[in-house]
Interface confidence: medium
């Protein structure tokens, strides 16, 4: 029989049990090595152990895998390719894992996988084809619905020559596999900018969370095409206002709930469109506790407490009266 | 695995209020709308309102508005559908589901009846 | 608020027919439908979103289409399992709002 226990339990398997009948195939629903399992919650938990790999004798129940804060390194492509397949499998945490390297086709053969975690391993190598699994031009729609990549940038010395939003982006976007996409995660990543074309590609979106990056402006950002979006989360970035564009667009979706605290409003001339905007509308979430940053004059000042007379510009000397 | 859980069935006389709650848990709670839809027994779904739990911000269809009240405790992962001066014809199974939009994942029921 | 008409309020049919059930919004939605499925003592149990979209893990007979105004889900053959009622509910605008349901029953 299986080694595996009840719904409230989780069984474990001893290391030397596997390595006595690693010359045979492995039993279709024995626990991997430093592993708990549970066949009644079809949920595995490989949870740090320090693995290096990921276990090859995965048991067919899984459901829920967790593999969490393991030494993984690299995702090779077809990581959970098994014989039968892992058809079971819809959410699968990789969270915390030293993975520094995703290949391309790293989840392919797993057809019903929902949610994928990535969270806090620092990516300075994720494939165009990590999730589309092949460079075709349209690629099979992915099952994913939920992409969780937070803090996956990697320091600043590990980085490749190349814009790591740009890396993330084209993992994203290739294949147009992941037109199912509802909920995409990309908080605490250092983003500075976000490409134009990422949104426009993801229809499907319901929740988009970029808190705690480094966004400075959503000038060439569109979010017309994202009708079903629900929840925008940009707490925690370095936005100085949003102009009249980007207003327009998130007033014109109609489930729209938008999270702004904690940005270094600039409250200038520049604001006074914004300003109107957020006394009228009711899709900025705790809008009352929007304050501004600068200029000094005017921090800490609530944005909806302002008036027009209060924002002003300071006038642009002409060059002859400007001082070097 | 994502679970919503909510109170056990309730008695009441008309007049009266009742108060439901609805456990979440196998995902982060703030991050999904909670809605409530109420079910009398043979009828069809009627949706009653929706409560944000990150904002407490709530909506209610006109038919319940100034009955209902939508609360949530985001330290215990629940929410709160109370619903005050109860008629007979408020006798029904009362889910909460999660999702703003479509909902996707259902409680297994309240039933409420309202008896004198 | 928004009508949602659904037609027809029961049916009969027999396993392996193909069945196919109508929701009619009194206005324009986009393709903001859902249907469900709710058995008897059960909870209602999402199908299809989005108007077309298949639900992880819902068996592939099911399909839904349908823009705007008119919308359709079909069975293409039907099991069984499949004896329950149906709801198609809109969530392009507050208050969302369910169609009354259409109950298919065994012939």
């Known amino acids: 029989s299986s080694p595996t226990s009840s719904a409230s339990s989780f069984s474990s398997s001893a290391p030397f049990l596997a390595s006595a009948v690693s010359a045979q195939p492995p039993l279709p629903d024995q626990c991997p090595a430093l592993c708990e399992c549970s066949e009644a919650a079809r949920t595995v938990k490989c949870v740090n152990r320090n693995l290096t790999e990921v276990p090859t004798d995965l048991p067919a129940y899984v459901r829920n895998l967790f593999l969490t804060g393991n030494q993984l390194a690299v995702l090779p492509a077809g990581a959970f390719a098994r014989r039968p397949p892992l058809a079971e499998l819809a959410a699968l945490n990789l969270s915390g894992s030293r993975l520094d390297e995703v290949r391309a086709g790293a989840f392919e053969h797993l057809p019903s996988l929902r949610q994928l975690d990535l969270s806090h391993n620092p990516l300075a190598d994720l494939s165009p084809f990590a999730f589309s699994g092949s460079n075709a031009s349209v690629s099979a729609p992915s099952p994913l619905v939920e992409l969780i990549l937070n803090h996956i940038v990697p320091p600043e010395d590990e980085r490749q020559n190349r814009s790591f939003e740009g890396m993330v982006v084209a993992a994203l976007l290739a294949g147009r596999a992941l037109q199912g996409l509802r909920r995409l995660e990309l908080a605490s990543n250092h983003f500075l900018y976000l490409p134009r074309d990422v949104l426009a590609q993801l229809p499907s979106l319901r929740h988009l969370d970029l808190s705690n990056n480094s966004l400075v402006s959503l000038t060439y950002v569109s979010f017309r095409n994202l009708t079903h979006l629900e929840s925008l989360h940009l707490e925690d970035n370095a936005l100085k206002v949003l102009h009249n564009g980007t207003l327009a667009e998130l007033q014109g979706l109609p489930h729209i709930r938008v999270f702004l605290d904690n940005n270094p409003w600039v409250c200038d001339c520049h604001m006074a469109d914004m300003v109107t905007w957020l006394k009228e509308t009711e899709v900025v979430q705790g809008k009352d506790r929007l304050t501004c940053a600068y200029p000094e004059k005017m921090r800490n000042r609530v944005l909806l407490e302002l008036n027009s007379a209060d924002l002003d510009c300071d006038p642009i000397l002409p060059p002859s009266l400007q001082t070097s | 695995q994502v679970q919503l859980v909510q109170s056990g069935a309730e008695v009441k006389k008309p007049g009266a209020s009742v108060k439901v709650s609805c456990k979440a848990s196998g995902y982060t709670f703030t991050t999904y709308d909670i809605i409530w839809v109420r079910q009398a027994t043979g009828q069809g779904l009627e949706w009653m309102g929706w409560?944000?739990?990150?904002?407490?911000?709530?909506g209610y269809a006109q038919k319940f508005q100034g009955r209902v009240s939508m609360t949530r405790n985001t330290s215990i992962n629940t929410a709160y559908m109370e619903l005050s001066t109860l008629r007979s014809e408020d006798t029904a199974l009362y889910y909460c589901?999660?999702?703003?939009?479509?909902?996707?994942?259902w409680g297994q029921g309240t039933l409420v009846t309202v008896s004198s | 608020d928004i009508q949602m008409t659904q037609s027809p309020s029961s049916l009969s049919a027999s396993v392996g027919d193909r069945v196919t059930i109508t929701c009619r919004a009194s206005q324009g939605i986009r393709n903001d439908l859902a249907w469900f499925q709710q058995k008897p003592g059960k909870t209602p149990k999402r199908l299809i979103y989005?108007?077309?979209n298949l639900q992880s893990g819902v068996p592939s007979r099911f399909s839904g289409s349908g823009s705007g105004t008119e919308f359709t889900l079909t069975i293409r053959s039907l099991q069984p399992e499949d004896f329950a009622t149906y709801y198609c509910l809109q969530y392009n605008r507050y208050p969302r709002t369910f169609g009354q349901g259409t109950k298919v029953e065994i012939k």
């Open positions: 989005d108007a077309s």
């Open positions: 589901a999660r999702g703003g939009l479509e909902p996707d994942y």
């Open positions: 409560m944000n739990p990150k904002s407490g911000n709530t």
